[in-house]
């Protein structure tokens, strides 16, 4: 759990973070696990500790091993372990599996490849990107911040992508490379921040006391199969099941897929025998997926019995 695998290439910079959650104000001590010898904090050393980070500038094959970090807060000491392996540089172009970071998938609509671990380093744009050891050239490839964007992705774009950047430490530059596989998904699906079609934000729904009322929460989440998407109702910020009012229940509506391919979900809130106190509640339609959560709030108001006359024209 609190042990993390890290790897790098000899003569490149490697920075490892202690796998314990902590605050910047916490003291972190680093040790060689085998010898219990403390790792220095002076930056003149090739291997030194800097708070949550352990820096190898540059790394050597002999640095491989397990390192212990102890995060000291005012209330606790927490221990973590960094399992570091430094490999010799390959003479050929092939990147072995043990040097690969997690595979990412892309599609025509979404083709970002993030450079792994880059957030730990002090680097400046632009990144250099390579595919199967060839430098990427052409207008289809755009290095943007810490990721590569590929326009009009095709199945031939699948392969191993390497990012290369320079880490700067006190005026000295060190090279870093990281490689991950990119696969291309066939389906043309995509996922968006949820869009709530109904109800409108801050909608006032008219209801009659003693009658039943239905509220529909309807939202769309993108195109094609969605990995995670949900719509639900909350009462005063509380889940319906936890609110404990048996008159008020939610029921899953249709899983819709419109002609334009949009994947949408409905959740119907059924209020039986509307009571006066129901008018005081805040009804929230929530739509959430991996992009985030959107909320539309509805209030109930009493339907005026003479409302059905209000659309008639009055003659003077």
């Amino acid at each position: 759990k609190f042990s993390k695998q890290s790897w790098g290439l000899e003569n490149e910079a490697l920075i490892v973070r202690c796998p314990r959650q902590g605050k910047p104000s916490y003291t972190v001590d680093w040790y060689y696990s085998q010898t219990n010898k403390s790792i220095p904090t002076q930056e003149r050393n090739r291997v030194f500790a800097s708070g949550q980070l352990l820096k190898f500038l540059p790394a050597a094959v002999a640095d491989s091993g397990i390192y212990t970090c102890i995060v000291r807060s005012p209330t606790f000491n927490r221990t973590g372990y960094a399992n570091v392996t430094i490999y010799k540089k390959q003479s050929d172009c092939n990147v072995p599996d043990y040097l690969m970071y997690s595979t990412v998938s892309g599609s025509e609509k979404n083709s970002k490849i993030y450079c792994p671990t880059i957030d730990l380093y002090n680097w400046t744009a632009p990144l250099e990107w390579f595919k199967n050891c060839q430098a990427l050239q052409g207008s289809r490839y755009r290095a943007h911040k810490s990721f590569l964007v590929i326009d009009n992705v095709m199945t031939e774009d699948a392969g191993d992508y390497t990012c290369k950047f320079i880490h700067n430490e006190n005026g000295a530059n060190y090279s870093v490379t990281a490689t991950r596989s990119f696969t291309v998904k066939d389906e043309q699906g995509f996922s968006l921040f949820p869009v709530i079609g109904a109800p409108a934000q801050n909608e006032i729904k008219e209801v009659e006391i003693g009658k039943n009322a239905n509220l529909t929460c309807s939202a769309c989440f993108g195109k094609g199969t969605q990995f995670l998407a949900a719509v639900l109702w909350q009462l005063n910020g509380t889940k319906i099941t936890d609110f404990g009012e048996p008159r008020i229940q939610q029921e899953e509506g249709q899983n819709q897929s419109f002609s334009n391919g949009l994947a949408c979900l409905d959740m119907v809130l059924r209020i039986a025998d509307v009571k006066e106190e129901d008018l005081l509640l805040q009804y929230d339609c929530l739509a959430l997926n991996l992009h985030g959560l959107r909320r539309h709030t509805v209030r109930l108001s009493r339907k005026n019995p003479i409302d059905h006359h209000s659309h008639h024209h009055h003659h003077h």
């Epitope: 759990k1 609190f2 959650q21 902590g22 605050k23 910047p24 104000s25 916490y26 995060v71 807060s73 005012p74 209330t75 606790f76 927490r78």
Partner: antibody, heavy 117, light 106 residues
């Protein structure tokens, strides 16, 4: 010795909001996390949420999401927990506790909140 | 969500007894389990954190063990002041307390 002193007991009507304070002494509130825990009469402990007072980051348990707000005033080393839309089942003792991200080490004496019409 | 099942809910024992309280999770959480003791009308007190680390000032008759999904708190020889309610707490994902174990004098 670290001490956490909470505000006094409260009686509230359903639908109202309660705000409890927790003053920390012999300890800089910015240096750790502040947690809040609910305990209904005769029941177990329920974690409500935590704040990193140094930057104001909060995380809340799903059960209390949307109704609870945890804040901290680093100038007075005081944390606050506000619970809104009170219902009778919110009648409980509320504890503040300081600790790191993972657990609580020092606790306040507790504040009894009674929700009754 | 991580579910915690603490057992037993009630436990009757005598001074000098060895008692064990168990906390089982529905998913592997390694050693992010902590144990608290609470006496009536008092705030909880941390006994053991991270599975087996005794908090300073806590008597050595208290010990914690286990990893993965099953954790235990053991009191090797019960003392009169140990009769209280004990809670486990997981902090692998947010924080969740077990339901509690009330330890009573037989």
């Amino acid at each position: 010795e670290v001490q956490l002193v909470q505000s006094g007991a409260e009686v509230k009507k359903p639908g109202a909001t309660v705000k409890i304070s927790c003053k920390v002494s012999a300890f800089n509130i910015k240096d750790d996390y502040m947690h809040w825990v609910q305990q209904a009469p005769g029941k177990g402990l329920e974690w409500m949420g935590r704040i990193d007072p140094a930057i104001g980051n909060t995380e809340y348990a799903e059960k209390f999401q949307g109704r609870v707000t945890i804040t901290a005033d680093t100038s007075t080393d005081t944390a606050y927990m506000e619970l809104s839309s009170l219902r009778s089942e919110d009648t409980a003792v509320y504890y503040c506790a300081t600790g790191d991200f993972y657990a609580m080490a020092y606790w306040g004496q507790g504040t009894l909140v009674t929700v009754s019409s | 969500d991580i579910q915690l099942t603490q057992s037993p809910s009630f436990l009757s024992a005598s001074v000098g007894d060895r008692v064990t309280i168990t906390c089982i999770t529905n998913t592997d959480i390694d050693d992010v389990i902590h144990w608290y003791q609470q006496k009536p009308g008092k705030a909880p007190k941390l006994l053991i954190y991270e599975g087996n680390t005794l908090r300073p000032g806590v008597p050595s008759r208290f010990s914690g063990s286990g990893s993965g999904t099953e954790f235990t708190l053991t009191i090797s020889s019960l003392q009169p002041e140990d009769f209280a309610t004990y809670y486990c707490l997981q902090s692998d994902n947010m924080l969740t307390f077990g339901q509690g174990t009330k330890l009573e004098i037989k």
